[in-house]
Interface confidence: low
């Protein structure tokens, strides 16, 4: 595996993306771990939801979040309020049983943020606060994500919404058909359950989908 470098600015958020083959890693949970030394173990930082179908839900461990677009095949890790000690070698992993496949090796580098102390949080160059009144600054790092903030919904969420919409249409059609034929609608078959209460419930009955 080649190592991909992601650079972030101290005090801001860094988003790390790990693309993978969504078919090959179908049904597998993912994890983000920190490499301890060149030959040391990879220490788990955060992993996706225990229910694979809920992998799109962002999970936090301290200032690190993970979310998985299982259909699009992109694992996204957010390191919020990046600190100098966050720099180092990490791995995106795909879990199966007690084994883990490396999806991507990531080197996180933390660049100094010599901007205004009041806004920047952890500044690695405290002498810089007065020096940047007139300096030209190019910001290539996106703004920090708030903890409750949800980015653009991944493919899996869109699919679930489509599922809900489709099931409701089917249920309405069945009710309409029953009414048209003058029959009393009986108990709903499983296919008509409203998956809005548990977005993963309906899809969990599909073959091959299980939490590993």
């Amino acid at each position: 595996h080649n190592t991909t470098v992601f650079q972030g600015v101290a005090g801001q958020s860094l988003q790390v993306s790990c693309p993978y083959d969504s078919m090959k890693h179908w049904g597998r949970r993912k994890a983000w771990c920190r490499q301890l030394g060149e030959k040391g173990p990879c220490q788990r930082v955060v992993s996706t939801h225990n229910l694979w179908l809920l992998s799109f839900l962002r999970r936090w461990n301290g200032s690190t979040a993970i979310t998985d677009d299982t259909l699009g095949g992109t694992l996204t890790i957010t390191l919020r309020n990046l600190q100098p000690h966050d720099a180092g070698l990490y791995q995106c992993q795909s879990l199966h049983g007690s084994e883990a496949d490396t999806l991507r090796k990531v080197l996180v580098e933390v660049l100094a943020d010599p901007l205004d102390h009041r806004d920047a949080g952890d500044l690695w160059f405290p002498g810089e606060s007065e020096s940047f009144e007139d300096a030209h600054v190019e910001h290539s790092i996106s703004r920090s994500l708030l903890e409750g903030e949800i980015p653009f919904p991944p493919t899996s969420i869109l699919l679930l919404l489509a599922c809900i919409f489709l099931i409701k249409i089917l249920a309405a059609s069945a009710l309409w058909a029953a009414a048209w034929h003058g029959q009393k609608p009986g108990t709903h078959p499983p296919s008509e359950l409203d998956c809005g209460h548990d977005p993963g419930y309906q899809l969990q009955t599909l073959p091959g989908l299980r939490d590993t």
Epitope: P84, A87, E109, P114, P126, G127, S131, A135, H136, H139
Partner: antibody, heavy 122, light 113 residues
Framework: EVKLLESGGGLVQPGGSMRLSCAAS????????MNWIRQPAGKAPEWLGL??????????EYNPSVKGRFTISRDNTQDMLYLQMNTLRAEDTATYYC?????????????WGQGVMVTVSS | DILINQSPASLTVSAGEKVTVSCKSS????????????LAWYQQKPGQFPKLLIY???YRHTGVPDRFTGSGSGTDFTLTISSVQAEDLAHYYC?????????FGAGTKLELK
Amino acid sequence: EVKLLESGGGLVQPGGSMRLSCAASGFTFTDFYMNWIRQPAGKAPEWLGLIRNKAYGYTTEYNPSVKGRFTISRDNTQDMLYLQMNTLRAEDTATYYCARIGINYGGSLDYWGQGVMVTVSS
Amino acid sequence: DILINQSPASLTVSAGEKVTVSCKSSQSLLYSESNQDYLAWYQQKPGQFPKLLIYGASYRHTGVPDRFTGSGSGTDFTLTISSVQAEDLAHYYCEQTYSYPYTFGAGTKLELK
């Protein structure tokens, strides 16, 4: 491997000018703050100034002791750092080093060049 | 400018001895927002350029032997060599990077008996 190599030193008369160069290799030059430091024989180093990285517009910071006489610049296409020294005085005689501020290093200088000797004398 | 008072100016020790070098700054080098102290230690062997030993007051630079330890916070800092080796013969300098201009201590010359 990170390497910094200074050149351009030598003997210059008081009141004269000199330009020092520092060739950088082994790292992404535009990502780093670059510094000049000098050290008179038998004395402690003296920080002269720095030039910031691409993200911060390659702006400069100087020690008041040399501000107005010394100018730091960089050529990012050639991975070169420069120190232009004007109106040189005898007290500017020293070994001059270029050095890099490391990422995550709190402003400290993680790599230095071998240094180049500048002698200001008539 | 922040003034750095480094002591002692010189030390003569035997191999295996423990050595401590002190640096005191004229103002605190602890930046509360990052909870970091902005002090570095350098080693300069005769005829060579300075090499970074310790940054952020206590973080050992890559490849630096663990007999070198940096400690302290605020205005008082210490470099400790737990068991001096022959190759440690050098000048040692501390440097503050809390505010411009960055300033160095006058240095400590470590000699072996």
